[in-house]
Interface confidence: low
């Protein structure tokens, strides 16, 4: 692959654990303006597999607030507005990166952490397992 | 709110931009074992609003690989397996944090960036707008 030369203007790393410990500017470059998922779309209500959004807060994590989706039904909403159990509402999950304060309560020292969050729900055809 | 005292074992911050610039340990604590979304579930294929997963790679970003969902159809799959345009397949989007190398090509200096990614698709009842 292409090797990109190191930028001569990079900060020096004086940390013994380098390259595991790096400097991160927390002044976020945000390409998006809307951070409240309830405002950004009403899909959670209009979906055939609707979900509720739960606020998960943790002051030792950055971002401290994460919204978690929980499917409202086991089945999916059919054309008549009823729950159809021939189909299943399932959460769509994604691994995201967060920063965890380490050591705890430190304002300027973090460790990267991967967590699995449910973003919304989708309606799937169930896998029917036949009993042997 | 509760004020948590600063841990006396925290690293000192000698950076003029503190608290914007922090130390981050990239040795990820991963609570999940499966990182390939295609392996983690086959919902993308079984959904009534199926999607394809596209690999988005950027060596200046951490993580360098992100999977983006694109809905396969404008409508949703009905019980007969046909696309039904009385319903709409829509992407479920989420803001995630990534690290962007800053200055570019630096191995040990990053800036936090928020990006919007499509995680999967869900089937929604359309908002039917009457033409004025």
């Amino acid at each position: 692959g292409i090797t990109i030369p190191r930028n001569p203007g990079c900060p020096n790393s004086e940390d013994k654990n380098f390259p595991r410990t790096v400097m991160v500017n927390l002044n976020i470059h945000n390409r998006n303006t809307n951070t409240n998922p309830k405002r950004s779309s009403d899909y959670y209500n209009r979906s055939t597999s609707p979900w509720n959004l739960h606020r998960n807060e943790d002051p030792e994590r950055y971002p401290s607030v994460i919204w978690e989706a929980k499917c409202r039904h086991l089945g999916c909403i059919n054309a008549d507005g009823n729950v159809d159990y021939h189909m299943n509402s399932v959460p769509i999950q994604q691994e995201i990166l967060v920063l965890r304060r380490e050591p705890p309560h430190c304002p300027n020292s973090f460790r990267l952490e991967k967590i699995l969050v449910s973003v919304g729900c989708t309606c799937v055809t169930p896998i029917v397992h036949h009993v042997a | 709110g509760i004020t948590i005292p600063r841990n006396p074992g925290c690293p000192n911050s000698e950076d003029k931009n503190f608290p914007r610039t922090v130390m981050v340990n990239l040795n990820i604590h991963n609570r999940n074992t499966n990182t390939n979304p295609k392996r983690s579930s086959d919902y993308y294929n079984r959904s009534t609003s199926p999607w394809n997963l596209h690999r988005n790679e950027d060596p200046e970003r951490y993580p360098s690989v992100i999977w983006e969902a694109k809905c396969r159809h404008l409508g949703c799959i009905n019980a007969d397996g046909n696309v039904d345009y009385h319903m709409n397949s829509v992407p479920i989007q989420q803001e995630i944090l990534v690290l962007r190398r800053e200055p570019p090509h630096c191995p040990n200096s990053f800036r936090l960036e928020k990006i919007l990614v499509s995680v999967g698709c869900t089937c929604v009842t359309p908002i039917v707008h009457h033409v004025a």
Epitope: S40, S41 | K70, C71, R72, H73, L74, G75, N82, V83, D84, Y85, N88, S89, V90, P91, Q93, L116, S118, P126, I127, V128, H129, V131, A132
Partner: antibody, heavy 118, light 110 residues
Framework: EVQLLESGGGLVQPGGSLRLSCAAS????????MSWVRQAPGKGLEWVSA????????YYADSVKGRFTISRDNSKNTLYLQMNSLRAEDTAVYYC???????????WGQGTMVTVSS | NFMLTQPHSVSESPGKTVTISCTRS????????VQWYQQRPGSAPTIVIF?????PSGVPDRFSGSIDSSSNSASLTISRLKTEDEADYYC?????????FGGGTKLTVL
Amino acid sequence: EVQLLESGGGLVQPGGSLRLSCAASGFTFSSYAMSWVRQAPGKGLEWVSAISGSGGSTYYADSVKGRFTISRDNSKNTLYLQMNSLRAEDTAVYYCARDLIWGVAGSWGQGTMVTVSS
Amino acid sequence: NFMLTQPHSVSESPGKTVTISCTRSSGSLANYYVQWYQQRPGSAPTIVIFANNQRPSGVPDRFSGSIDSSSNSASLTISRLKTEDEADYYCQSYSPHSVVFGGGTKLTVL
């Protein structure tokens, strides 16, 4: 009242680029999918591209795939079409349209003329 | 991709009824909505029928749409023709990832 106003058309040489804009008003822009449709002089309508209300899904006609990019800025109520590697056959009036539902162009702008010629 | 085929032109006298057909080359027309657009000379198109047979408010009830699954075709019927109906008419439908217009039919009101 729904209003769609296209701009950015003009004369460009083959291989050149142009960015069309469509300023929308009179409705909640982010709730609607939007499309671009073009019409070559004396010819019929040709669908070019569509984008979902959130901007998360985009679709293109085969004739423009890889050359044109549709995007939207919901904070500015504006739809865009970035056109690169333009060809003579891209010469047309370009209309932006608000979709009733996906692919159903309920309201149209008055169009902007793009001429690709050396 | 599929195609939508329309007659190049049709003509009829004022007060009469005219029907414009639109045939889909492949894929069931019944699975996808059909729209009809009117375009008068020098103007942008306007929708006259959407979702096979739905009429937007402001469009006279002289305009109606239908589909025939057996022939995989759609029709636009305009009754009690008026001179102001003279225009080009386009049918339009979908495939899963794209939108397709018919070639257009020029309606002349004699």
